[in-house]
Amino acid sequence: SPAQRWSMQVPPEVSAEAGDAAVLPCTFTHPHRHYDGPLTAIWRAGEPYAGPQVFRCAAARGSELCQTALSLHGRFRLLGNPRRNDLSLRVERLALADDRRYFCRVEFAGDVHDRYESRHGVRLHVT
């Protein structure tokens, strides 16, 4: 079958109440079939490519475990399995300040060097 292109799928927006939790869905496709090398998953806030990171994890070659390296205030947790092309993120104990746009990003390293980030992101509405 032909190689897939890079793409990311996120909903336009997610709504939740302050104090509750929210899930920010993000799935992706990539052209590197059977890739099992090092992988980094990143979520950032505000703007794509340049906004501050709120979550980052890394998986070693051959591992499904994406070890958390950054979780702002300990409130961000990866639900999706990046090896299954899912970067869905759970945000706990929502505050009004979390009301902003979030962008998911995946990076491949090792034999393959490639990366992709959602351009439009998902808008989190906190009420």
């Epitope: 499904e64 070890q67 639900l79 399995n81």
Partner: antibody
Framework: QVQLVQSGAEVKKPGASVKVSCKAS????????VSWVRQAPGQGLEWMGV????????GYNEKFKARVTITADTSTSTAYMELSSLRSEDTAVYYC??????????????WGQGTLVTVSS | DIVMTQSPDSLAVSLGERATINCKAS??????VDWYQQKPGQPPKLLIY???NRYTGVPDRFSGSGSGTDFTLTISSLQAEDVAVYYC?????????FGQGTKVEIK
């Protein structure tokens, strides 16, 4: 051939801790994730957590996060699962399982024989 | 957590007949479902991975299908050695979660 051999059955009192071992052979231990899965008597399977022995990184089911610790010793190719503050509902068979990999697909391809942990006063 | 619901809970099938087990995920898990067989006193054994791929050494009477939220394990011609409990498991989200199991017996 790949083998996972677990430690023997344990009987513990409520409030105590138990540490179950899983000795791997037949493959390069640091390269593959090892998960722990439990099964209460007559019940289904429940994933508890995972370790990547090469990095020592761990991930846990939130249900057990406060009570479980998974470790690995690459020098002896052994993974460990310690569960604390035991209660009667923790009575179960505990399995270790290797997360195998083939062409970008992961799966539990080899399992330990299981360790029965009984919690009783 | 993702809830995996199997149906039926138990199934009695005549030797040589077809057995079908269904598994429904509480949300989309792509094709990331595996099937395991467990016999009494033994650990689970992998049959099918990634919804449709038969694991090495598994007889071709076992097949899997489905994606999204609905998955099926089919035993095309039940043999005596297939008496066991069968579990589906999703690995798209953490924590990994299993179905409650389906017991297959001979009628």
């Amino acid at each position: 051939q790949v083998q996972l051999v677990q430690s023997g059955a344990e009987v513990k009192k409520p409030g105590a801790s138990v540490k179950v071992s899983c000795k791997a052979s037949g493959y390069t231990f640091p390269r593959y994730d090892v998960s722990w899965v439990r099964q209460a008597p007559g019940q289904g399977l429940e994933w508890m957590g995972v370790i990547h022995p090469g990095s020592g990184g761990t991930g846990y089911n939130e249900k057990f996060k406060a009570r479980v610790t998974i470790t690995a010793d690459t020098s002896t190719s052994t993974a460990y699962m310690e569960l604390s503050s035991l209660r009667s509902e923790d009575t179960a068979v505990y399995y270790c399982a290797r997360r195998g990999l083939n062409s970008g697909y992961w799966f539990f391809d080899f399992w330990g024989q299981g360790t029965l942990v009984t919690v009783s006063s | 957590d993702i809830v995996m619901t199997q149906s039926p809970d138990s199934l009695a099938v005549s030797l040589g007949e077809r057995a079908t087990i269904n598994c429904k995920a509480s949300q989309n898990v792509g094709s990331n479902v595996d099937w395991y067989q467990q016999k009494p006193g033994q650990p689970p054994k992998l049959l099918i991975y990634e919804s449709t791929n038969r694991y090495t050494g598994v007889p071709d009477r076992f097949s899997g299908s489905g994606s999204g939220t609905d998955f099926t394990l089919t035993i095309s011609s039940l043999q005596a050695e297939d008496v066991a409990v069968y579990y589906c498991m999703q690995s798209n989200f953490f924590p990994f979660t299993f179905g409650q199991g389906t017991k297959v017996e001979i009628k």
